[in-house]
C-alpha cells in the first residue's frame, strides 16, 4: 500500500560496503559456440561493493576479493531430450570495500 | 585473498525477492533548471525486487510498492559560499515480489 502521508525523514547515505547482488550466468560464459542449451541456475547471488563516497573524486571500490567456483548444469537438448552436463563458473565476491581516489590503482590481496 | 583452489559447490539460484540496492539521487530529481548545486547524500538505500525465475517468459517483478519521501540537502554555491536548502525526494521501495509473465501488467497496491 502507498500508505498515508508520512513525514519526510532525513535521507541516510548508502555507505560504501558489500551488498548482495544478482549475477546473471550468461550462456556465453559456459559455451561460446553453441546456443542449444540452458544453464541452471540462470542467476546467483554475489557480494559486491556499492554505495557512495564523500565526493566525486573518490569511488567505492573493493580492496579484498575472493574467487568462488560454482557448479552449474548445462542442459543440452538432443533429439528433444535433455542431457545434463556440469560446468564450472567462477564468481567474484567482494569481501571489503573502501572509498578510493578514482585514478589510484587498487590493490587486491 | 584470491584463495586456494576450492571445490566448486553447486550454484544456488538467486531467488526472486527484495534486496537492498543503492539509488543515486540525481541532481535532476531536485532541480532540472539549475546545475550549480550539490545534493547530500548523493545516494541512498532502497529495497528492490531482483533475482531470476524458472524460465525466460517470466520476470521477477514487484507486487507491492511503497513510496517513501526523504529529505535531502540542496547545497547551492553563491559567491563561493554554500547555502543549505532542504528538498524532498520520493523513493520507491519494493515490499513484495513475484515471478510474473512478461506481458502481464503488474498490479501495485
Amino acid at each position: 500500500s502507498l500508505g498515508s502521508l508520512t513525514i519526510a525523514e532525513p535521507a541516510m547515505i548508502a555507505e560504501c560496503k558489500t551488498r548482495t547482488e544478482v549475477f546473471e550466468i550468461s550462456r556465453r560464459l559456459i559455451d561460446r559456440t553453441n546456443a542449444n542449451f540452458l544453464v541452471w541456475p540462470p542467476c546467483v547471488e554475489v557480494q559486491r561493493c556499492s554505495g557512495c563516497c564523500n565526493n566525486r573524486n573518490v569511488q567505492c571500490r573493493p580492496t579484498q576479493v575472493q574467487l568462488r567456483p560454482v557448479q552449474v548444469r548445462k542442459i543440452e537438448i538432443v533429439r528433444k531430450k535433455p542431457i545434463f552436463k556440469k560446468a564450472t563458473v567462477t564468481l567474484e565476491d567482494h569481501l571489503a570495500c573502501k572509498c578510493e581516489t578514482v585514478a589510484a590503482a587498487r590493490p587486491v590481496t | 585473498s584470491l584463495g586456494s583452489l576450492t571445490i566448486a559447490e553447486p550454484a544456488m539460484i538467486a531467488e526472486c525477492k527484495t534486496r537492498t540496492e543503492v539509488f543515486e539521487i540525481s541532481r535532476r530529481l531536485i532541480d532540472r533548471t539549475n546545475a550549480n548545486f550539490l545534493v547530500w547524500p548523493p545516494c541512498v538505500e532502497v529495497q528492490r525486487c531482483s533475482g531470476c525465475c524458472n524460465n525466460r517468459n517470466v520476470q521477477c517483478r514487484p507486487t507491492q510498492v511503497q513510496l517513501r519521501p526523504v529529505q535531502v540537502r540542496k547545497i547551492e554555491i553563491v559567491r563561493k559560499k554554500p547555502i543549505f536548502k532542504k528538498a524532498t525526494v520520493t523513493l520507491e521501495d519494493h515490499l513484495a515480489c513475484k515471478c510474473e509473465t512478461v506481458a502481464a501488467a503488474r498490479p501495485v497496491t
Epitope: 549475477f23 546473471e24 550466468i25 556465453r28 560464459l29 573493493p62 576479493v65 567474484e92 587486491v108 | -
Partner: antibody, heavy 120, light 107 residues
C-alpha cells in the same frame, strides 16, 4: 547485437593525462571480464589492461603498470582507462574488448578503437 | 613473459590457395591460443579460440591446430575477403601477448 564504442581519445602532451571510455550494449556487461588492447601506428597488437566482471581484479603489463588504471561502472555498462604520465610510445589506437569469464579467455568482441596521440 | 613468434611475417597468395601460418610460443601454453584477423582501419576479429575451436560465424575454411608450443592457422581455400593481417595470442598467463602478425597479400 553486441556493441562496444570507445571515446575520449585525442592529442595530449607528454606527461599529460587522458581518460578513455567504452560504452557497452547488447550483452550482460556485468557478467564479463573486459580488456583494453592498443595498436601503435603500423605496428602489432599489445595488451594493456584487463578487469574482472565485478571490478575487483585488475591486470596490467609492466609497460603501463602504475601509469594506467582500468575501472568499470556496471550500472552504466561502461569501461574506463585512465592514462597518466603519457609518453610518445603510448601513441596508439586503443580498443576495448570483451574477454569472457576470466583473464584466460579470448577477446570475443571489439570496439572500433579511439586514437591517442602523445606529442608536443 | 611468454614470447609469441609468428611466421612468415608476410606472404603472397592467390585466391583458391591453401595458406598456412604458424605461431610458436616460448614455453608451453597448452591450448590457450587464439587467432585474430585484422583488416586495415578495422578492429581485430576473433577467428579461432582454444587453438582449434572455430568462433561462431567464421567460415569453415579457417581452421586451427596445435598444442603446447607450436600452432597453425590454415585457410583451406583463400577468398578475396581473406586478405588481411593475422595475429596469434596466448591467454595462458599474464602478460597476455600477441604474435607480431602475418600479412596475407594478393599475389
Amino acid at each position: 547485437e553486441v556493441q562496444l564504442v570507445e571515446s575520449g581519445g585525442g592529442l595530449v602532451q607528454p606527461g599529460g593525462s587522458l581518460r578513455l571510455s567504452c560504452a557497452a550494449s547488447g550483452f550482460t556487461f556485468s557478467s564479463f571480464w573486459m580488456t583494453w588492447v592498443r595498436q601503435a601506428p603500423g605496428k602489432g597488437l599489445e595488451w594493456v589492461a584487463s578487469i574482472s566482471a565485478g571490478g575487483g581484479i585488475t591486470h596490467y603489463p609492466d609497460s603501463v603498470k602504475d601509469r594506467f588504471t582500468v575501472s568499470r561502472d556496471n550500472a552504466k555498462n561502461s569501461l574506463y582507462l585512465q592514462l597518466n604520465s603519457l609518453r610518445a610510445e603510448d601513441t596508439a589506437v586503443y580498443y576495448c574488448a570483451e574477454s569472457g569469464g576470466d583473464i584466460y579467455s579470448d577477446f570475443d568482441y571489439w570496439g572500433q578503437g579511439t586514437l591517442v596521440t602523445v606529442s608536443s | 613473459d611468454i614470447q609469441m613468434t609468428q611466421s612468415p611475417s608476410s606472404l603472397s597468395a592467390s585466391v583458391g590457395d591453401r595458406v598456412t601460418i604458424t605461431c610458436r610460443a616460448s614455453q608451453s601454453i597448452s591450448n590457450y591460443l587464439n587467432w585474430y584477423q585484422q583488416k586495415p582501419g578495422k578492429a581485430p576479429k576473433l577467428l579461432i579460440y582454444a587453438a582449434s575451436s572455430l568462433q561462431s560465424g567464421v567460415p569453415s575454411r579457417f581452421s586451427g591446430s596445435g598444442s603446447g608450443t607450436d600452432f597453425t592457422l590454415t585457410i583451406s581455400s583463400l577468398q578475396p575477403e581473406d586478405f588481411a593481417t593475422y595475429y596469434c595470442q596466448q591467454s595462458y598467463s599474464t602478460p597476455l601477448t600477441f604474435g607480431g602478425g602475418t600479412k596475407v597479400e594478393i599475389k
